[in-house]
Each structure stands twice: as C-alpha cells, then as structure tokens.
C-alpha cells in the first residue's frame, strides 16, 4: 500500500518525490494531485511542472527543493486535518506506458498541546529548532515552528523522533526516486 507520512496541524507537510533527469535541464512534466493517481495525469491537480518551469500551482502547495535537478517533493503549508489523504506524484515520462506513479498517504495529527513552562528553559534555546533530514535527494529542512519547552525526559523522545524521521526519509527516497535515461 501507500507509504505513509505524518504532520501536525499547523505545520508544513513534506511529501517526497524525485527523479533523475537524463541530462541537466532536460526536465520531465510532473503533476501532483489530491487522491490516488488516476488513469491519466493527476486528479484534483494542486501543482504541475512542464519541461521548463512550474506552470500551475495552488495556494499552500509548493516545491521546496530544486525541481530542475529532479526534486519534485511537495510541501503543503500550514496543514489542517482536511489535508489528510492520498496524494499522487506522477512523473510524466514521454512514451507509452512510461509514467511513474507514486501514491503517498498523508496523515495529519492534531497539534500537541504545549505543556506549562518548565525550569529547563535555558536548554531549549540551545536545542536546534530546524531539523534537517537527508536522503538521496537534496536536504529537506523541516521547520518545527515554536517547539514546546523541553525537559530532560523529553530529549530522548525527540532524538528518537529525529532518528525515525531520518530513517523514514531514506525509505521514502528509495521508494519514490526514479532514474531517467
């Protein structure tokens, strides 16, 4: 079934999709749509690229990576519960039967309730608020926004989440990366 990705309400969601252009600048049209990949192209298109540029997009949906190098991963800004569901990344390689279709399931969780302030406030200033996960494609930076105050018992939990995020990113990239040419 579809690979699953998670984000919290109010955060930006990241749905990875990559291809390797046959030559620099030799781009392939790509579409992103809400709902599983249909018979042709994408249903409910939210973003589309052509051989040169992004030629259609809707608010809150954008490509954060370098799509000219084949990183066509979708970022959805400020997600709500209504953004949950399956998304289609379709890499429209010319020729019969050549399209690559990826269905990615986005699960939106309610925002965590911010706990009351604790005495470990000084630690939070030193803790990075930008988590960078790297897979086969360009680095993806996930802005966590305002993190809750972190006490010492939460550090290992956050470290585990970061480790899981890195692992998930490696799995995602291996599953949604294709080479052309």
């Amino acid at each position: 079934s579809e690979v699953e990705y998670r984000a919290e309400v109010g955060q930006n969601a990241y749905l990875p999709c990559f291809y390797t252009p046959a030559a620099p600048g030799n781009l392939v049209p790509v579409c992103w749509g809400k709902g599983a990949c249909p018979v042709f192209e994408c249903g409910n298109v939210v973003l589309r690229t052509d051989e040169r540029d992004v030629n259609y997009w809707t608010s809150r949906y954008w490509l954060n990576g370098d799509f000219r190098k084949g990183d066509v991963s979708l970022t959805i800004e400020n997600v709500t519960l209504a953004d949950s569901g399956i998304y289609c990344c379709r890499i429209q390689i010319p020729g019969i039967m050549n399209d690559e279709k990826f269905n990615l399931k986005l699960v939106i969780k309610p925002a965590k309730v911010t706990p009351a302030p604790t005495r470990q406030r000084d630690f939070t200033a030193a803790f990075p608020r930008m988590l960078t996960t790297r897979g086969h494609g360009p680095a993806e930076t996930q802005t966590l926004g305002s993190l809750p105050d972190i006490n010492l018992t939460q550090i290992s939990t956050l470290a585990n989440e970061l480790r899981d995020s890195r692992l998930a990113n490696d799995l995602r990239d291996s599953g949604a990366t294709i080479r052309i040419g």
């Epitope: 990949c37 018979v39 192209e41 019969i96 269905n103």
Partner: antibody, heavy 114, light 107 residues
C-alpha cells in the same frame, strides 16, 4: 455534469471505413483525455485509444494500423475512424472521459455485415 | 498486455445477501484497478477506483480490496437494482485491460 453522445451508422460493409462522432457537453475537449472503448457481443471490453487536450493521440497497438481519432474543438466533438472493418469489429462503441473513465456515453451499436 | 482473469462469469444470489467477484492480474498492477457496473442500454458506471476508493454517490454496500495480482469486489445487502454485469479494469499502464465480466442475477 459531463455528457457524451455517440452517433454514426449502425451498419457498415466489410472493408469499408467506420466513422463515429462523440458530442461532448458539460466540459471542453481542450482539457482532459477523450477515449473510445468498445464492447463485443460476447461482453468483452476493449480499450481503443484517446485524443488528449493537446490533440496528441494514443492507440491500442492491436488497432494502430487501422485507427484514427481526431477532433473539432469548435464543435466540441471528437471522432473515431476505423479502416478496413471486418465482422470482428461488430460491437457497441462508447465514448468515455474522466479521471477513471467516469463518464460514458450510452453507446452506439455497429454491425459489420455484407 | 496485462491479462485480467475475472471470476465467476455469472452468479446468482438472494436479496439481502452478499456476493464477491475476483480479478487476478497476470502481473502486479500496484492496486490500479477499478470496478464498473454495466446495465443494458447504458454506459458502464464507475463504482470503485484504486482498489477500494468508493466513487462519490456509490453506496457503502460496495467494496473492494486486494494488492499485487489479486483483487476482489463485494456487494453486501443485495438489492434488486444491483442486477447488472460487473467488470474490473487495470490501469497500471496505458495498455488498459478489462476483465471478462460477471453477470449478477438475483434468485
């Protein structure tokens, strides 16, 4: 809602060319993909091909030498031409559109017979 | 071409009962399967796409499941208007192929 209506002859002689028209209302044929599918008397369904929003076409390889799909955007119609028909082409022909072949005409039944 | 082997070719069931139709693909079709209901004199009607996604307006009595090469389609709480022929379609690639159809009758 999208509506499709097939029209054309009901009887064609072997070796002749079949021409069918699909009239589309509720959508423009300059967006999406516009298909022909046929159903043989034994109930088998066969995908024949499409013409896309840009005018590009795709044909089932088994028909490639005989089939042509063209369009007239000013009339919002597209057409199926099938050359050198035989009795094996006797079928009900449907024009179809939509993300998952959601919209079908009611079909037009063609008999190939001398 | 990907072959879709659909079974049974016909079946008879009682009102209120449940029926299941299967389609087996000759290779993995990555869940890209749709199911259609066809009644005489009309065009086929899309019921389900991407294995289990119900088309808007289709009752939840209809369901689909499967993965890889093996897929099934079920109708529960059978009603008289369910009398029709049902087809599967694989759309994993442009060489779209349909199953041979299952004719459903009510006892």
């Amino acid at each position: 809602d999208v509506q499709l209506q097939e029209s054309g002859p009901t009887l064609v002689k072997p070796s002749q060319t079949l021409s069918l028209t699909c009239s589309v209302t509720g959508d423009s044929i300059t967006s999406g993909y516009w298909n022909w599918i046929r159903k043989f008397p034994g109930n088998k369904l066969e995908y024949m091909g499409y013409i896309s929003y840009s005018g590009s076409t795709y044909y089932n390889p088994s028909l490639k030498s005989r089939i042509s799909i063209i369009r007239d955007t000013s009339k919002n119609q597209y057409y199926l031409q099938l050359n050198s028909v035989t009795t094996e082409d006797t079928a009900t022909y449907y024009c179809v559109s939509g993300n998952h072949f959601d919209y079908w005409g009611q079909g037009t039944t063609l008999t190939v017979s001398s | 071409d990907i072959q879709m082997t659909q079974s049974p070719s016909s079946l008879s069931a009682s009102l209120g009962g449940k029926v299941t139709i299967t389609c087996k693909a000759s290779q993995d079709i990555n869940r890209y399967i749709a199911w259609y209901q066809h009644k005489p004199g009309k065009g086929p009607r899309l019921l389900i796409h991407y294995t289990s996604t119900l088309q808007p307006g289709i009752p939840s009595r209809f369901s689909g499941s499967g993965s890889g090469r093996d897929y099934s389609f079920s109708i529960s709480n059978l009603e008289p208007e369910d009398i029709a022929t049902y087809y599967c379609l694989q759309y994993d690639n442009l060489l779209f192929t349909f199953g041979s159809g299952t004719k459903l009758e009510i006892k």
